[in-house]
């Protein structure tokens, strides 16, 4: 029996000084053997342990900036304006989103070597982190809107009722989240490392970009609408009136904005081509996907980034959440109180004035 | 690195049916396609049924109507179903994409 390499780079390679002339029935390669090729996944050229470095640095400043955040929030009891609440909120949700990094990184090192349970909770927690800040956003989007647009002293400074959204938003984004919940388990396969991801049995394709194009559109799209109607009409009004004190008190919260949608937006795009291809709305092809594939990894990489950045915005832009920083640390004698501002007040995010609550 | 591992070879009276298996690894499997091979002692390779990346099935024209090519997504593997075997279907049966191969199964019909 004749020997044939195993390992031949290409069809014409196979083929090369064969006596066609013989062959049984065809007497030339047919081209439709060329497809016949695999489509192999081009990853990313990111190291998988650069990533996993990356995860770790992001939960380390995640776990120190957030937990920060909080205990400023928690210890300006006095001036703390709804926005504060908001973000209060905020932090906790990027905290405990913190909190699975770990997993998530040793997942890219090993595959997903922790069980269904783990692969549930963990994923829920992404989830849930990233419906419940866009969420909370809109509510500042709206409250700054009420405030400035209308000068009015909203209905959200009824503190039961900033508590009531807050946990209605905990719920929305629970529910948002809820698919997650239900269809992610662990799955297992001869070839392939195991994976957490959701499995629906024979109908998984269709179902995943039901789920996904529901929580997408309602997650995303529509508090994205809202903050922009909002923060358009309030950035409208702040020019007309020239209002220089609450433009300035409005940069923090534009900041954490624009961060939000800048490590949020590319991802979900790319998810929604995905989504796209998919539903085979977009012919998938090898090089699409792979495209996709490499977006999908890299700006995920972006999302992730997001838990830790908030704090950051504060420290650089928020006055007052350095103010109440030193405030804490001056009360635990970590600091002389005389180093503190003068104008330190007791508010991480503001006070009111007026009708009108300023923030940062 | 892609893989290829087949099973389902064996003996089997003239007449009678066998199921190649070809599980896939180190691929996107859905957008991939392959080929099924075969070689005869003495005799050259030549390529049985073919699957594309888009999914057309192509048979050669002494197996038409009797293999059937097919794939499962769902656990990246590739078919191929074999009725009314004949002795001249005596041959180590291989899979293939592009410049990936298995190992080979044998496959004996005997009269």
């Known amino acids: 029996m004749e020997d044939f390499n195993m390992e031949s780079d290409s069809f014409e390679d196979f083929w090369k000084g064969e006596d066609l002339s013989n062959y049984s029935y065809s007497s030339t390669l047919p081209p439709f053997l060329l497809d016949a090729a695999p489509c192999e996944p081009e990853s990313l050229e990111i190291n998988k342990y650069f990533v996993v470095i990356i995860y770790a640095l992001v939960f380390l400043l995640s776990l120190l900036g957030n937990s920060l955040v909080m205990l400023v929030i928690l210890y300006s009891r006095v001036g703390r304006s709804v926005t504060d609440v908001y973000l209060l909120n905020l932090a906790l949700a990027d905290l405990l989103f913190a909190l699975t990094l770990p997993i998530w990184a040793a997942s890219k090192v090993n595959g997903w070597i922790f069980g269904t349970f783990l692969c549930k909770v963990v994923s829920l927690l992404k989830e849930v982190n990233f419906y419940s800040g866009i969420l909370l956003l809109a509510c500042i989007s709206v409250d700054r809107y009420l405030a400035i647009v209308h000068a009015t002293r909203t209905l959200t400074q009824k503190r039961y009722l900033v508590k009531f959204i807050c946990l209605s938003i905990w719920g929305l984004s629970l529910l948002l989240a809820l698919p997650v919940l239900l269809f992610r388990r662990t799955v297992y396969s001869s070839n392939v490392s195991p994976a957490c991801y959701e499995d629906m049995g024979n109908n998984t394709a269709n179902w995943r970009m039901l789920l996904r194009i529901l929580p997408q559109s309602f997650g995303f799209i529509v508090p994205l609408l809202i903050m922009l109607f909002c923060y358009g009409f309030t950035l409208r009004t702040l020019f007309k009136a020239h209002m220089g004190q609450k433009h300035r008190a409005m940069r923090v919260i534009f900041a954490v904005v624009l961060i939000f949608l800048l490590c949020w937006l590319p991802y979900n795009l790319v998810l929604l081509a995905d989504t796209l291809m998919r539903t085979q709305v977009i012919q998938e092809t090898c090089e699409r996907r792979n495209h996709i594939d490499r977006a999908l990894d890299a700006t995920e990489i972006l999302g992730i980034l997001h838990s830790c950045l908030n704090p950051l915005i504060y420290a650089f832009i928020g006055q007052k959440f350095r103010h109440g920083l030193l405030k804490i640390l001056a009360i635990h004698g970590l600091i002389s109180k005389d180093s503190l501002p003068k104008d330190s007040r007791p508010s991480f995010v503001g006070s009111s004035s007026g009708h009108t609550s300023t923030t940062l | 690195e892609v893989q290829l591992v087949e099973s389902g070879g064996g003996l089997v009276q003239a007449g009678g049916s066998l199921s190649l298996s070809c599980a896939a690894s180190?691929?996107?499997?859905?957008?991939?396609?392959m080929a099924w091979y075969r070689q005869a002692p003495g005799r050259q390779r030549e390529w049985v049924a073919v699957?594309?990346?888009?999914?057309?099935?192509h048979y050669a024209d002494p197996v038409k109507g009797r293999f059937t090519i097919s794939r499962n997504n769902a656990e990246n593997t590739w078919y191929l179903q074999m009725n009314s075997l004949k002795p001249e279907d005596t041959a180590i049966y291989y899979c293939?994409?592009?410049?990936?191969w298995g190992q080979g199964t044998q496959v004996t019909v005997s009269s």
């Open positions: 293939n994409t592009g410049r990936y």
């Open positions: 180190g691929l996107i499997f859905r957008l991939s396609g």
């Open positions: 699957l594309t990346k888009d999914g057309t099935l």
